[in-house]
Interface confidence: medium
């Protein structure tokens, strides 16, 4: 349904508040280095223009596409060349190439200062003085640091952020009320950003078909009572929403997401029995709730799949007539029966089935050829089951911090060329799988663990893509989306790696470590551990443990000393010498 003015259409659909917030997010995700005030000015100009189009859709420029309008606005930034370098060349292009150019310059690891949380009283004063600016600043700071954050979901986070300040700034103990809420929002926000980053990578690097396959599997697990046609409709709509958001079309994305939530709630009887509570909530909460809703119960007495997908004489005929529909039905039928499998495992099974049909439907006796296809599934199912069992046992034995350290050593030996901050960040996140998933009963462990690992390994892939240093990482990241985790799991120690030169400065510590939070102190120690492995990749677990224990004792001793700085200087030299001796450096 074509509209005379797209900008007027979206302004009317979304309302002024959401329109302004989404334009701010879009601009901050594109121009990540621009000051807040510059973005606010651009947003206000766009909003005023949109209002003129609402008043008269035939007014000058109102018929232009949103990409044209927003791109033109971004290209008015005076400091574009100085701040962004070659990104300024995007402005010489025409749409749609200009928008593609902006997208390619999004930076997953922008050089921005860490967000430091001010004192609670300072934050509450700022909130009361100018609530609107305070919330806009939150959107801006999150969006520029997470250029693929799911925009309509960021509006939901902002709503919760506002609610936290509204409640807690009136509380007797503001800090006790506010800080846990902000910690929760920060952790959930990081997780949400990483999950969305995988969706965008799936669409951008592997195409719409890969994303749709993921969506069929996940929605079939979540809505096992829904018919295949219903699931297919939801998949098509969801793909459109995420394609738009990943492509920077945030107004369309938010609008379409609202329409999808409306459709799901109007048709919940034919989708899932678990949607009732979600559908009673306001829009932002409703969409979030639907996205997180628990799996519905599987229908009773589902027939075996063998009849339709192996025993039937029409398998090759049905496959040839509509390959993707037939494979989609296979994935749907398999996924709805297996909420206990990870989505990536289901996709591996579907890929194996597809490969078998491609081969067998061209054979002399197709049925004889594919009759044993499901025997090929057994090892694919058992591999993640065994891996999760082993790693959960290790996690329960070591606890989170030491489990992270074991993974740090494992991954540094696999891909020692990767930067130390990236190895620390990724391994810490990989290690969180233990506390996140090992507490679950076995039926929920695999979907929790393997699908979470897919999200974390995607972080490694997008950070590595910015500055590629390892052919092994590139290979695991680009060959197959669903086999990334098995690919990394299969990597052994990189025998071609030339150990890093020893640099005492890397292992020199100062009294400032004593004032760090427990988390920051862990990161310092884990950074040292990665550097140790890079210097001595053949070091045994026992050697590394001994050095790390000595290091922990050294930090504890010097933090208790009267003259901390002298202690760090003198004891630090001894520690470096002892470590070199222990590791044969």
């Amino acid at each position: 349904d074509a509209h005379k003015s797209e900008v007027a259409h979206r302004f009317k659909d979304l309302g002024e508040e959401n329109f302004k917030a989404l334009v701010l997010i879009a601009f901050a995700q594109y121009l990540q280095q621009c000051p807040f005030e510059d973005h606010v000015k651009l947003v206000n100009e766009v909003t005023e223009f949109a209002k003129t189009c609402v008043a008269d859709e035939s007014a000058e420029n109102c018929d232009k596409s949103l990409h044209t309008l927003f791109g033109d606005k971004l290209c008015t930034v005076a400091t574009l060349r100085e701040t962004y370098g070659e990104m300024a060349d995007c402005c010489a292009k025409q749409e749609p190439e200009r928008n593609e150019c902006f997208l390619q310059h999004k930076d997953d690891n922008p050089n921005l200062p860490r967000l430091v949380r001010p004192e609670v009283d300072v934050m509450c004063t700022a909130f009361h003085d100018n609530e609107e600016t305070f919330l806009k600043k939150y959107l801006y700071e999150i969006a520029r640091r997470h250029p693929y954050f799911y925009a309509p979901e960021l509006l939901f986070f902002a709503k919760r952020y506002k609610a936290a300040f509204t409640e807690c700034c009136q509380a007797a103990d503001k800090a006790a009320c506010l800080l846990p809420k902000l910690d929760e929002l920060r952790d959930e926000g990081k997780a949400s950003s990483a999950k969305q980053r995988l969706k965008c990578a799936s669409l951008q690097k592997f195409g719409e078909r890969a994303f749709k396959a993921w969506a069929v599997a996940r929605l079939s697990q979540r809505f096992p009572k829904a018919e295949f046609a219903e699931v297919s409709k939801l998949v098509t709509d969801l793909t459109k929403v995420h394609t738009e958001c990943c492509h920077g079309d945030l107004l369309e994305c938010a609008d379409d997401r609202a329409d999808l939530a409306k459709y799901i709630c109007e048709n919940q009887d034919s989708i899932s029995s678990k949607l009732k509570e979600c559908c009673e909530k306001p829009l932002l909460e409703k969409s979030h709730c639907i996205a997180e809703v628990e799996n519905d119960e599987m229908p009773a007495d589902l027939p075996s799949l063998a009849a339709d997908f192996v025993e039937s004489k029409d398998v090759c005929k049905n496959y040839a007539e509509a390959k993707d529909v037939f494979l989609g039905m296979f994935l749907y039928e398999y996924a709805r029966r297996h909420p206990d499998y990870s989505v990536v495992l289901l996709l591996r099974l579907a890929k194996t089935y597809e490969t078998t049909l491609e081969k067998c439907c061209a054979a002399a006796d197709p049925h004889e050829c594919y009759a044993k296809v499901f025997d090929e599934f057994k090892p694919l199912v058992e591999e993640p089951q065994n891996l999760i069992k082993q790693n959960c046992e290790l996690f329960e034995q070591l606890g989170e911090y030491k489990f992270q350290n074991a993974l740090l050593v494992r991954y540094t030996k696999k891909v020692p060329q990767v930067s130390t901050p990236t190895l620390v960040e990724v391994s810490r996140n990989l290690g969180k799988v233990g506390s996140k998933c090992c507490k679950h009963p076995e039926a929920k462990r695999m979907p929790c663990a393997e699908d979470y690992l897919s999200v974390v390994l995607n972080q490694l892939c997008v950070l590595h893509e910015k500055t590629p240093v390892s052919d092994r990482v590139t290979k695991c990241c680009t060959e197959s989306l669903v086999n990334r985790r098995p690919c990394f799991s299969a990597l052994e120690v990189d025998e071609t790696y030339v150990p890093k030169e020893f640099n005492a400065e890397t292992f020199t510590f100062h009294a400032d470590i004593c004032t760090l939070s427990e988390k920051e102190r862990q990161i310092k120690k884990q950074t040292a551990l990665v550097e140790l492995v890079k210097h001595k990749p053949k070091a045994t677990k026992e050697q590394l443990k001994a050095v790390m224990d000595d290091f922990a004792a050294f930090v504890e001793k010097c933090c208790k000393a009267d003259d901390k700085e002298t202690c760090f200087a003198e004891e630090g030299k001894k520690l470096v010498a002892a470590s070199q001796a222990a590791l044969g450096l």
Epitope: D301, H338, D340, F374, F377, P441, A443
Partner: nanobody, 116 residues
Framework: QVQLVESGGGLVQPGGSLRLSCAAS????????LAWYRQAPGKQRDLVAR???????HYADSVKGRFTVSRDNAENTLVLQMNSLKPEDTAVYYC??????????WGQGTQVTVSS
């Protein structure tokens, strides 16, 4: 295929307890739902309780609050803990496995008799 063997049946007094076990072997990796059914003499076979691969459970109204179904995927076993047994619980209890790939499988059955 999946093979099932039940154990734990026997004679018990009203108000007593029994624990039925079902050991699965063969292509257990393909099982999604496990269930207990029962058949009293001259009656049809009825669902008692089932548990899906996602861990969700369903009970017949007549046993709710008295029977508990659980599964151990690592050991490939299904358990039915039966408390506060009544004479009307007397039946042959069958283990049932619904598999993704194979036709449904049934055990041979184990007799439970509740009588004073």
């Amino acid at each position: 295929q999946v093979q099932l063997v039940e154990s734990g049946g026997g004679l018990v007094q009203p108000g007593g307890s029994l624990r039925l076990s079902c050991a699965a072997s063969g292509s257990t990796w393909s099982i999604n739902t496990l269930a207990w059914y029962r058949q009293a003499p001259g009656k049809q076979r009825d669902l008692v309780a089932r548990i899906s691969s996602g861990g969700s459970t369903h009970y017949a109204d007549s046993v709710k609050g008295r029977f508990t179904v659980s599964r151990d995927n690592a050991e490939n076993t299904l358990v039915l803990q039966m408390n506060s047994l009544k004479p009307e619980d007397t039946a042959v209890y069958y283990c049932y496995a619904q598999s993704t790939w194979y036709p449904p499988s049934w055990g041979q059955g184990t007799q439970v008799t509740v009588s004073s």
